[in-house]
């Protein structure tokens, strides 16, 4: 004969577990049901009722199969210097990352608490590492034979032209000026530009603050909680 | 409005039976989730939960006295009775009724009534 | 069946002043724990569910914090109201009350 079918609640077998998407209630010392996700447990079960659930509220949410008796709260509004990548729902929180030029300073479990801007190289300083979502850029000195005239966050030290009588010797923030109507160069002529940070939602590593920088605003990081987790909720 | 009242006899002589009445206002024990639950406290001291009884007929009890209690309840006339066996002096406590939430904290309480056990 | 330590059973403290008390559990009761006041010859009044929801009408100078068997009620700057005897309680498995600590003014 086949196994009966038990419907919850219900004793588990001794030594085994609950099925998926049940939990055992070590008050009841049952088998019940879980929420799906986007609700919330309402009533816990008892040895001959089982949970009862009911649909998260307005900005709370719950992501997975669970037995919380409340929802979860959505994150705060984006801010000024994010854009929301993923909008708060009962089934899922809102998630805020960082606009374009911006990089996240302080990440959370999903998205960005604290975005910075991206620092800017000087003139007579290039990029060395690009910005990404998650760190910012870091800049070097211009080495002898190419510079910077510009203060960016995407321009690397680009060659000196090459003179046939050179007027003007080029450093570090400066290109060579020639005398010659036909100057040459070891590259092709123009600024060369990194691509801006592509999304990725890598972990934030620090950068390291690099002296040769244009002066950049110091941020206070708030260090308060993440956004409670789900209590065991796992299937 | 929610309320909670105890009633029942302020001294009881040792192993003597406890009968302690709790009737109460504002929510029915028929409404899924609904509770209601005794806890006592000796003079000066922690509170000790006892038992309590849900919508559904469902009972639990501290292990420790479970031997000693039973707890029913009158749906029609909102009451729950707790009896409590073979009392003893250092059962001398406040007994107060509770009511219980869906998600099992107590957030109603009674006044609560004084019994004492002496011969 | 779990056992609730909380600690300390008594403390002074002045107006304004920042109270903490913790509550330890044996095993892991999850989120669940309400704390409760309770002044002479009253009933517990509660006053925080599931760790950290505040009852409505309760000052948010109360708050909780902890998951798991590690659990903190704070009064972030006392007032002579909050003089009385605080509880915790856990319900994630049975019901267990902690022993108590008595709040009083310098």
């Known amino acids: 004969l086949p196994a009966q079918v038990a419907f919850t609640p219900y004793a588990p077998e001794p030594g085994s577990t609950c099925r998926l998407r049940e939990y055992y209630d070590q008050t009841a010392q049952m088998c019940c049901s879980k929420c799906s996700p986007g609700q919330h447990a309402k009533v816990f079960c008892t040895k001959t009722s089982d949970t009862v659930c009911d649909s998260c509220e307005d900005s709370t949410y719950t992501q997975l199969w669970n037995w919380v008796p409340e929802c979860l709260s959505c994150g705060s509004r984006c801010s000024s210097d994010q854009v929301e990548t993923q909008a708060c729902t009962r089934e899922q929180n809102r998630i805020c990352t960082c606009r374009p030029g911006w990089y996240c300073a302080l990440s959370k479990q999903e998205g960005c608490r604290l975005c910075a801007p991206l620092r800017k190289c000087r003139p007579g300083f290039g990029v060395a590492r690009p910005g990404t979502e998650t760190s910012d850029v870091v800049c070097k000195p211009c080495a002898p034979g190419t510079f910077s005239n510009t203060t960016s966050s995407t321009d690397i030290c680009r060659p000196h032209q090459i003179c046939n009588v050179v007027a003007i010797p080029g450093n570090a923030s400066m290109d060579a000026v020639c005398t010659s109507t036909s100057p040459t160069r070891s590259m092709a002529p123009g600024a060369v530009h990194l691509p801006q940070p592509v999304s990725t939602r890598s972990q934030h590593t620090q950068p390291t603050p690099e002296p040769s920088t244009a002066p950049s605003t110091s941020f206070l990081l708030p260090m308060g909680p993440s956004p409670p987790a789900e209590g065991s909720t796992g299937d | 409005q929610v309320t909670l009242k105890e009633s029942g006899p302020a001294l009881v002589k040792p192993t003597q039976t406890l009968t302690l009445t709790c009737t109460f206002s504002?929510?029915?024990?028929?409404?899924?989730?609904?509770?209601v639950g005794w806890i006592r406290q000796p003079p000066g001291k922690a509170l000790e939960w006892l038992a309590h009884?849900?919508?559904?007929?469902?009972?639990f009890y501290n292990p420790s006295l479970k031997s000693r209690l039973t707890i029913s309840k009158d749906t029609s006339k909102n009451q729950v009775v707790l009896t409590m066996t073979n009392m003893d002096p250092v059962d001398t406590a406040t007994y107060y009724c509770?009511?219980?939430?869906?998600?099992?904290?107590?957030?109603?309480w009674g006044q609560g009534t004084t019994v004492t056990v002496s011969s | 069946d779990v056992q609730m330590t909380q600690s300390p059973s008594s403390l002074s403290a002045s107006v304004g002043d920042r109270v903490t008390i913790t509550c330890k559990a044996s095993?892991?009761?999850?989120?669940?724990i309400a704390w409760y006041q309770q002044k002479p010859g009253k009933a517990p009044k509660l006053l925080i569910h599931y760790t950290s929801t505040l009852q409505p009408g309760i000052p948010s100078r109360f708050s909780g914090s902890g998951s798991g068997t590690d659990f903190t009620f704070t009064i972030s700057s006392l007032q002579p109201e909050d003089i009385a005897t605080y509880y915790c309680?856990?319900?994630?498995?049975?019901?267990?009350f902690g022993g108590g600590t008595k709040v009083e003014i310098k």
């Open positions: 095993q892991d009761i999850n989120k669940f």
């Open positions: 509770a009511r219980l939430t869906g998600t099992r904290y107590f957030d109603y």
């Open positions: 504002g929510f029915s024990l028929s409404t899924s989730g609904m509770g």
């Open positions: 309680l856990q319900y994630g498995n049975l019901w267990t």
């Open positions: 009884i849900w919508w559904d007929d469902d009972k």
